[in-house]
Amino acid sequence: GCLTQLYENAFFRGGDVASMYTPNAQYCQMRCTFHPRCLLFSFLPASSINDMEKRFGCFLKDSVTGTLPKVHRTGAVSGHSLKQCGHQISACHRDIYKGVDMRGVNFNVSKVSSVEECQKRCTSNIRCQFFSYATQTFHKAEYRNNCLLKYSPGGTPTAIKVLSNVESGFSLKPCALSEIGCHMNIFQHLAFSDVDVARVLTPDAFVCRTICTYHPNCLFFTFYTNVWKIESQRNVCLLKTSESGTPSSSTPQENTISGYSLLTCKRTLPEPCHSKIYPGVDFGGEELNVTFVKGVNVCQETCTKMIRCQFFTYSLLPEDCKEEKCKCFLRLSMDGSPTRIAYGTQGSSGYSLRLCNTGDNSVCTTKTSTRIVGGTNSSWGEWPWQVSLQVKLTAQRHLCGGSLIGHQWVLTAAHCFDGLPLQDVWRIYSGILNLSDITKDTPFSQIKEIIIHQNYKVSEGNHDIALIKLQAPLNYTEFQKPICLPSKGDTSTIYTNCWVTGWGFSKEKGEIQNILQKVNIPLVTNEECQKRYQDYKITQRMVCAGYKEGGKDACKGDSGGPLVCKHNGMWRLVGITSWGEGCARREQPGVYTKVAEYMDWILEKTQSSDGKAQMQSPA
């Protein structure tokens, strides 16, 4: 299953399959997730080790048993790959690292005014993988405001150095934010020239293209079909690059197919997995396990559930079957691709779905009255769980926020439905940033069911929570995916990085905003919060957030939206915007429904009609 916990001051001994430099544990975890063999990782922050060569070291590890012995190492961080973690699987990494220089091949230098502008340039440059920016206070004046665009053979820095007044980060192309755009065309009977960066075996050009998209240095590819004249080159997928970023030449060639990486696509990237099943095809590789199952789909599910399994072959040979069950061969290789592909067999083959974003139909939980005042504009894909709840009567208007917690579920505030309990009048917009982008042609979700907490009473602040079941499930993308829920009764976690988002008023007597706003707000203890509300009881089912001096807060139109906190690199839905005394007033924190206190209720209500829980229970 999906294991998200991180181990502080621990290092996994042995099992090394690769090593690299990464700026933090979360990026190391992402590299582990996308590495075909990596199940575990250990990361050494600069503070944890004196050996300069090992600082920022990210060690990717495999283990037949799925675990390795942990040794104590002060400052080290270890954890698991996020394979099998559904929508948490993403190659997108937005963080900017201050005081850190990520080294690589510097291929472009320009003057820019901010680190964000530098990141944008990297994202809009086809070859840029990461960048460094020298701030205005950098010690050498001639380098100030320099934006260095970089790449490396592995897509990660060749070294990472602590350096004052330098900020580094990665391209946001994996976040589907590139302005370059992409070529979706597949070119039949055409071979591209240039430099081969890798060679793998794939059953078709589409798998080849997806592998190219997620390979750090692949810009385009050529695939040799199973009827290619040279037998040893059949099903070979050549991943390619060039100085210019495009093929310098192409040659008409029978039984070849070429195309481009889709990493520069805007707003949508292919999933990093291959779901198609190939009848009459055998995939060769190292045997992991053989099991008898009923049908090829069950074989694929079995492979997906066995975390080390990369691909499978389901044999229909009479000697491999008994009654209705046949042998399911679970296999793996060094690079995640079959070592041999044979056609015209009595088998069916395919890949593990362990890297599919959609995962199962579950909602992520973790193993362990009120626009935003004083906020700033959000960017695309920054808060992909945020939805706008709009009412269409004579006109249409935004009324509340909400959080996507599953393919078919939105969590919001009960008071959003005060006086408007009819599901037909509501329209739910997901995957949007600007309300002005909504036109009559913009797709929206309709409500199948509104589930208001049974103890909620109109005009009272208690139990201000409601679930919305959508009429049709939503697909997950970089711009539309769920937020993880906390564990039941989560009281031990100390959250220090919390944000509230919404399109609500920017002042007490204001108006709905066009661009989704965000504001970083500290949590306030319930005891402190209670002292500031002389007439209202702050219960253990509420959480408060706000600045002593005021100035930043949620406001009218933000209700029902998320209060999210980042902990161990993962965002969790800590609160639902509920109520407050005015907006952003001094000494009057905003009050939010504490989601952890309602986990039993959420899990109970989101049971599907067949009784199968539609979300993973928290550990």
């Epitope: 002292k531 500031r532 002389q534 009881k537 219960t539 000494e587």
Partner: antibody, heavy 116, light 106 residues
Framework: EVQLQQSGAELVKPGASVRLSCTAS????????IFWVKQRPKQGLEWIGR????????KYDPKIQGKATLTADTSSNTAYLQLSSLTSEDSAIYYC?????????WGQGTLVSVSA | DIQMTQSPSAMSASVGDRVTITCEAS??????IAWYQQKPGKAPKLLIY???TLQSGVPSRFSGSGSGTDFTFTISSLQPEDIATYYC????????FGQGTKVEIK
């Protein structure tokens, strides 16, 4: 309209116990805290304790602990103050009050006279 | 335990006068002080909380100020209906009242 109706005056003997009631209307006591405050004749105000009727959690002034017991019955929307081992020092007006961080609305008070 | 020392214990002033009452806490109470008015035979009424926030419906002639351990309650222009005893209350750590100040008309 928010109201707290307290029980009538009590004349009790030293060493005895008494239970005072505070019935709420216009709101649900589960949604608030109920506080109790003592005022001796011609004297100031003293906080006795607080109850959260939703879960019966209580907090008392350490000086008063043992003398007073706070309870609540949410079905009748009523809070109670039980005073035990009464002495002349306990002769006072006892107020119930509702609120969050502090006492926002008060009952009319109940006079308790301890006399042989 | 936090002690609240309120002064004066009693005072008389004329209608229209500015009246000031002070309260000193034995420890820093983080501005968590409230002021109550109690008229004879009546229950106390909340006037001000969190040092200076006026409870809704309370006339603006009542105000509060201070920080740390020293706090002041002011009636900018005394009215006949303001004749009462005024109490400060700290609510930073449990609850402690001051001894009260009885305000009379000269």
């Amino acid at each position: 309209e928010v109201q707290l109706q307290q029980s009538g005056a009590e004349l009790v003997k030293p060493g005895a116990s008494v239970r005072l009631s505070c019935t709420a209307s216009g709101f649900n006591i589960k949604d608030t805290y109920i506080f109790w405050v003592k005022q001796r004749p011609k004297q100031g105000l003293e906080w006795i304790g607080r109850i959260d009727p939703e879960n019966d959690n209580t907090k008392y002034d350490p000086k008063i602990q043992g003398k007073a017991t706070l309870t609540a019955d949410t079905s009748s929307n009523t809070a109670y103050l039980q005073l035990s081992s009464l002495t002349s020092e306990d002769s006072a007006i006892y107020y119930c009050a509702k609120g969050g961080g502090l006492f926002a609305y008060w009952g009319q008070g109940t006079l308790v006279s301890v006399s042989a | 335990d936090i002690q609240m020392t309120q002064s004066p214990s009693a005072m008389s002033a004329s209608v229209g006068d500015r009246v000031t009452i002070t309260c000193e806490a034995s420890h820093d109470i983080n501005n968590y002080i409230a002021w109550y008015q109690q008229k004879p035979g009546k229950a106390p009424k909340l006037l001000i909380y969190y040092t200076s926030t006026l409870q809704s419906g309370v006339p603006s002639r009542f105000s509060g100020s201070g920080s740390g351990t020293d706090f002041t309650f002011t009636i900018s222009s005394l009215q006949p209906e303001d004749i009462a005893t005024y109490y400060c209350l700290q609510y930073d750590n449990l609850f402690t009242f001051g001894q009260g100040t009885k305000v009379e008309i000269k």
